[in-house]
């Protein structure tokens, strides 16, 4: 269960591939579209608003009646979208929606290191966000590889301004 | 209870070794980053060294890097640090310490040792 | 490496003073930052993480905030079991940095 409704803490970055390939949203017929691109250079990133939560593993889960605390994300590119994990069609989706939001629009974070980290679905664990033929989509990983492939792993280079207001 | 003991501190001489150990119950260690951060006497904290839940990712401090080596047994829930080449200003109180998230180095270390004593000194 | 300074160094204080302790970043976060308390020969304790978020137990006289480079701990009614040395831990990058640490000793 998440701790709270409202994050922990908040932060403004850009979402780049494990390649330094830019996540970039287009508004296209009134709906967000989510690309994989190499950026020009003089072209300025897309920020994304991420938003920190806690939750509590379940203490059967982590075997030893202990509750484990995890960071939860949602990822929100522009006031009132985010982020979501489609489990049916394997994708991942900009929707709009209000708050309280949907279970789907959580991710567990896993830090590899500080700005290297993979968004592991909350409504189906072992599926992560990843990069699939220039685009994002969801991606189950075998724990036993050690959450290393490439293709889930994501940099966030933090932007340091106000971030409350981002549109 | 929730608990890390440390061990394996003493007395040794500069340029020799030492191989510390923290022993972890109360919690799915293999779910957590982990950290050793030492105490100089009279002086503040310094972080030394972390390694990653799984054993696969580990990050040193530029006074300890080539060193020491952080290691960890999942199995006997149980972290090391491997200390080389010792030197006077190695003598410290080292800390195992807990991150406050599994798979996340965010947060802060929620859990610490009582403390192991090393003493560099001829 | 982010290097965290803390001030004042020591400061003296009576029960039920309100305190502040402020930690500076060389250069900039969101609010990955925890403070500590550690009373001398004991190992620290966490009060605060990501920058004012209250760790379970910590009484609530302890108050946490701030982010980019500027961050405060505040104590709004100092208890005897309060004197003690206090660090704050940026948990934003590697290398992790401590700040020096401020000693709220007994005036």
């Known amino acids: 269960s998440i701790t709270g409704i409202s994050p922990i803490t908040e932060s403004l970055a850009s979402l780049s591939t494990y390649n330094d390939q830019s996540i970039t949203f287009a508004l296209e017929d009134e709906s967000y579209e989510i690309y994989v691109e190499d950026l020009k250079k003089d072209k300025k990133k897309d920020k994304v608003l991420l938003s920190y939560y806690e939750s509590q593993h379940p203490s059967s889960e982590s075997g030893d009646g202990v509750d484990g605390k995890m960071l939860m994300v949602t990822l929100s590119p522009t006031k009132d979208f985010w982020l979501q994990a489609n489990n049916k069609e394997h994708s991942v989706e900009l929707h709009k929606c209000e708050k309280p939001l949907p279970d789907q629009a959580f991710f567990v974070l896993h830090n590899r290191s500080f700005n290297c980290v993979s968004f592991e679905c909350k409504t189906d664990p072992g599926v992560f966000i990843g990069v699939k033929d220039n685009h994002l989509a969801l991606i189950k990983v075998d724990y036993s590889e050690n959450l290393g492939s490439e293709n889930i792993l994501f940099k966030l280079s933090e932007i340091l301004e106000h971030h409350h207001h981002h549109h | 209870e929730v608990q890390l003991v440390e061990s394996g501190g003493g007395l040794v001489q500069p340029g020799g070794s030492l191989r510390l150990s923290c022993s972890a119950s109360?919690?799915?260690?293999?779910?957590?980053?982990m950290n050793w951060v030492r105490q100089a006497p009279g002086k503040g904290l310094e972080w030394v060294t972390a390694?990653?839940?799984?054993?696969?990712?580990?990050y040193y401090a530029d006074s300890v890097k080539g060193r020491f080596t952080i290691s960890r047994d999942n199995s006997k829930n149980s972290l090391f640090l491997q200390l080389n080449s010792l030197r006077a200003e190695d003598t410290a109180v080292y800390y195992c310490?807990?991150?406050?998230?599994?798979?996340?180095?965010?947060?802060?270390?929620?859990?610490w040792g009582q403390g192991t004593m090393v003493t560099v000194s001829s | 490496d982010i290097q965290m300074t803390q001030s004042p160094s020591s400061v003296s204080a009576s029960v039920g003073d309100r305190v502040t302790i402020t930690c500076r970043a060389s250069?900039?976060?969101?609010?990955?930052l925890a403070w500590y308390q550690q009373i001398p020969g004991k190992a620290p304790k966490l009060l605060i993480y990501?920058?004012?978020r209250l760790q379970s137990g910590v009484p609530s006289r302890f108050r946490g905030s701030g982010s980019g480079t500027d961050f405060t701990l505040t104590i709004s009614s100092l208890q005897p079991e309060d004197f003690a040395t206090y660090y704050c831990?940026?948990?934003?990058?590697?290398?992790?940095?401590f700040g020096g640490g401020t000693k709220v000793e007994i005036k």
């Open positions: 390694i990653s839940g799984s054993g696969g990712g580990t």
């Open positions: 831990q940026q948990a934003n990058s590697f290398p992790l940095t």
């Open positions: 250069q900039g976060f969101s609010s990955w």
């Open positions: 990501a920058a004012s």
């Open positions: 109360g919690f799915t260690f293999s779910s957590y980053a």
């Open positions: 310490a807990k991150q406050t998230y599994t798979s996340s180095w965010y947060g802060g270390f929620d859990i």
